[in-house]
């Protein structure tokens, strides 16, 4: 969490941002909140990015002001106009790309004063893994697949019965570049699995951590997946 305070002159106001991650090829949110003002027309929101000449987005007098917007953000940005009055200056970013990563500044002016806070925005790819029994294999084998990751993640297998066991000798992980030549498909195979046990395939990079669980019994197979973003630090 980054909390910024105002600049000299008028009173300072508190602006709060949360470091976040964007999944490339989807819309992303850059979070920013501030001490609200009672009059929308008195609020100015400016989003800036380190190393970018033009503005990322500007909202003033109750509407978007995009004449100074940098070309790389043209047609891609929006604030939640109906939530500005309650202190929400968060930015929606359409079709996040790797190049959108960097340091952003959320700069606010209200009748109470000015304030700003920086935000570290990471971009990458992350997806839910799916674990299945591989019936084509000669022995009992599990196959964990996740369609899109970037940067290249680590894959670790774990089991409920053999807690703390190292499965690196009985597993094999491969990374296959996807057609857009950025993200990769993750495939990990675990050999010699035993029945009546729960296995977890954990995929992690510096942006996200995802887990796919599978419980195999003689009568049924149960699956569960979970994904968590790692870098939600507020400032």
């Amino acid at each position: 969490l980054i909390i910024g305070f105002g600049i000299s002159g008028r009173h300072s106001i508190t602006v709060t941002t949360v470091a976040s991650a964007g999944n490339i090829g989807e819309d992303g949110i850059l979070s920013c909140t501030f001490e609200p003002d009672i009059k929308l027309s008195d609020i100015v929101i400016q989003w800036l990015k380190e190393g970018v000449l033009g503005l990322v987005h500007e909202f003033k007098e109750g509407k978007d002001e995009l004449s100074e917007q940098d070309e790389m953000f043209r047609g891609r940005t929006a604030v939640f106009a109906d939530q500005v009055i309650v202190g929400n200056a968060s930015l929606r970013l359409k079709n996040v790309q790797l190049t959108d990563a960097g340091t952003y500044k959320c700069y606010i002016i209200t009748s109470k004063g000015k304030g700003n806070a920086n935000l570290e925005y990471k971009t990458g790819a992350f997806s839910m893994p799916e674990v299945n029994v591989d019936y084509n294999a000669s022995s009992e084998t599990l196959r964990c697949e996740a369609p899109r990751w970037f940067p290249q993640p680590t894959v670790v297998w774990a089991s409920q019965v053999d807690q703390g066991a190292n499965f690196s000798e009985v597993s094999n992980t491969s990374f296959e570049l996807n057609s857009e030549n950025v993200t990769m498909k993750v495939v990990s195979v675990l050999y010699n699995v035993t029945i009546n046990n729960t296995y977890s395939c954990m995929i992690e990079n510096d942006i996200a951590k995802a887990t796919g669980d599978i419980k195999v019994t003689e009568s049924e197979i149960k699956r569960r997946s979970h994904l968590q973003l790692l870098n939600s630090k507020a400032s």
């Epitope: 999944n23 490339i24 090829g25 989807e26 819309d27 987005h57 509407k63 978007d64 995009l66 043209r74 047609g75 891609r76 940005t77 929006a78 604030v79 106009a81 109906d82 929606r92 359409k94 079709n95 790819a125 997806s127 369609p147 899109r148 996807n178 057609s179 857009e180």
Partner: antibody, heavy 116, light 109 residues
Framework: EVQLVESGGGLIQPGGSLRLSCAAS????????MNWVRQAPGKGLEWVSV???????DYADSVKGRFTISRDNSKNTLYLQMNSLRAEDTAVYYC??????????WGQGTTVTVSS | EIVLTQSPGTLSLSPGERATLSCRAS???????LAWYQQKPGQAPRLLIY???SRATGIPDRFSGSGSGTDFTLTISRLEPEDFAVYYC??????????FGQGTKLEIK
Amino acid sequence: EVQLVESGGGLIQPGGSLRLSCAASGFIVSRNYMNWVRQAPGKGLEWVSVIYGSGRTDYADSVKGRFTISRDNSKNTLYLQMNSLRAEDTAVYYCARDADYGLDVWGQGTTVTVSS
Amino acid sequence: EIVLTQSPGTLSLSPGERATLSCRASQSVSSSYLAWYQQKPGQAPRLLIYGASSRATGIPDRFSGSGSGTDFTLTISRLEPEDFAVYYCQQYGSSPLYTFGQGTKLEIK
């Protein structure tokens, strides 16, 4: 040249299924938000479905649970699988690319007629 | 759901005249996510304006877009014979993800 070419339309009975294809050239489908938009005879434009660059999908309420959008990255082709077709699905179906600047590239359209 | 209402439904003008088409949203729309399209009979729509006011590639400068919040306008400064068509505004970003106005038909007087 950046181009989209649809195919697969035709006459189908209510309750039937049809798969539309949209072949892209001059750009990579998986790097863009790819959409299906339809236009009933004499009517306006109606958005049907999107597949994001990430592969996630979204649908208009009118087709949710009946239509499935997908893509084949190796063929650079977009698809729309339409099941449980109804008379009100009769329309010209366009595929369209959203390259952040709005729907900037459209196919020529393929006609779907649902009638008994 | 954001509803886009275009007016007038039909606009009858002569070549050389100025055309002003309106698009009103039921709630605030980001200027970045507002676009205008032109469609001629038997053809696919063509992107004219994106980001409320930026002309798409190859679009003549007689076409201009303006507005913000809930009120947007497409202006054609001097009508050419090839401009007579149906015009749609469109927004991105809420559910449904893309919404079109019902269209304005621009016809020759």
